[in-house]
């Protein structure tokens, strides 16, 4: 059936995880995610 693998995000620095289609940097504490990144190891849009 598959689909259970969650490949490790191989990005420089911490706090990257797959959000949307790419590995993205998560939002800092106290902020929420407005939009995920649109490139590998990119920055999410946080508010």
């Amino acid at each position: 059936q598959g689909g259970t693998r969650s490949p490790r995000c191989d990005c420089a620095g911490d706090f990257h995880k797959k959000i949307g289609l790419f590995c993205c940097r998560g939002c800092p504490a106290g902020h929420y995610l407005k939009a995920p990144c649109t490139e590998p190891c990119g920055n999410s849009t946080c508010l």
Epitope: G3, T4, K18, G20, L21, F22, P40
Partner: antibody, heavy 120, light 111 residues
Framework: EVKLVESGGGLVKPGGSLKLSCSAS????????MSWVRQTPEKRLEWVAA???????FYPDSLKGRFTISRDNARNTLYLQMSSLGSEDTALYCC??????????????WGQGTSVTVSS | DIVLAQSPASLLVSLGQRATISCRAS??????????MHWYQQKPGQPPKLLIY???NLESGVPARFSGSGSGTDFTLNIHPVEEEDAATYYC?????????FGAGTMLELK
């Protein structure tokens, strides 16, 4: 066996709307990112939209506002709502599954497609 | 948008010889230690089939006569030795950013 079966295509007049469906089987649909890709009569491939497993939608700027991707995980079905259609939208529309080993969009299974013709 | 220029548009190769297909990107598709370029094969009446991902990784079940190389903006798909069943159109695709784009395709014909 992974199967993706598209339906809903047909002949539509310029300015019209159409909703395409893609029925998925043979894999855990809800765990996968999915895309719609179209193939023009000149055989060019164009990415149309994507819906990630965690609920985000993505479009090329050129189609944003006219096309809407959605999914029903309970029905294992991906949809594409298309509006304000023009002759440039004439194509074979395929749904594609993104590979689950990848943290980037690459498509490892494709459906045969459903044909959309925009003409008066 | 990243434009992918494939060459040649068509290729005539003898059985057992080498086929080389090029894909050039309008900007680098390499970042974070990876090259986000992928290759597909499409036979008439069939949907595309993934051959190679991240420039050089062979998809499961794809014969070892297919290989990919390159980084930055220049990428190559090699088929050696070419077999009859390899007659098809080959497309490159990047996932360096959105929107995803594809090359225009290279049609491989056998002599």
């Amino acid at each position: 066996e992974v199967k993706l079966v598209e339906s809903g295509g047909g002949l539509v007049k310029p300015g019209g709307s159409l909703k395409l469906s893609c029925s998925a089987s043979g894999f855990a649909f809800s765990n996968y990112d999915m895309s719609w890709v179209r193939q023009t009569p000149e055989k060019r491939l164009e990415w149309v939209a994507a819906f990630s497993s965690d609920g985000y939608t993505f479009y090329p700027d050129s189609l944003k506002g006219r096309f809407t991707i959605s999914r029903d995980n309970a029905r294992n079905t991906l949809y594409l709502q298309m509006s304000s259609l023009g002759s440039e939208d004439t194509a074979l529309y395929c749904c594609a599954r993104h590979a689950d080993y990848a943290n980037y969009p690459v498509m490892d299974y494709w459906g045969q497609g459903t044909s959309v013709t925009v003409s008066s | 948008d990243i434009v992918l220029a494939q060459s040649p548009a068509s290729l005539l190769v003898s059985l057992g010889q080498r086929a080389t297909i090029s894909c050039r990107a309008s900007k680098s598709v390499s970042t974070s230690g990876y090259s986000y370029m992928h290759w597909y094969q499409q036979k008439p009446g069939q949907p595309p089939k993934l051959l190679i991902y991240l420039a050089s990784n062979l998809e499961s079940g794809v014969p070892a006569r297919f290989s990919g190389s390159g980084s930055g903006t220049d990428f190559t798909l090699n088929i050696h030795p070419v077999e009859e069943e390899d007659a098809a159109t080959y497309y490159c695709q990047h996932s360096r950013e959105l929107p995803l784009t594809f090359g225009a395709g290279t049609m491989l014909e056998l002599k």
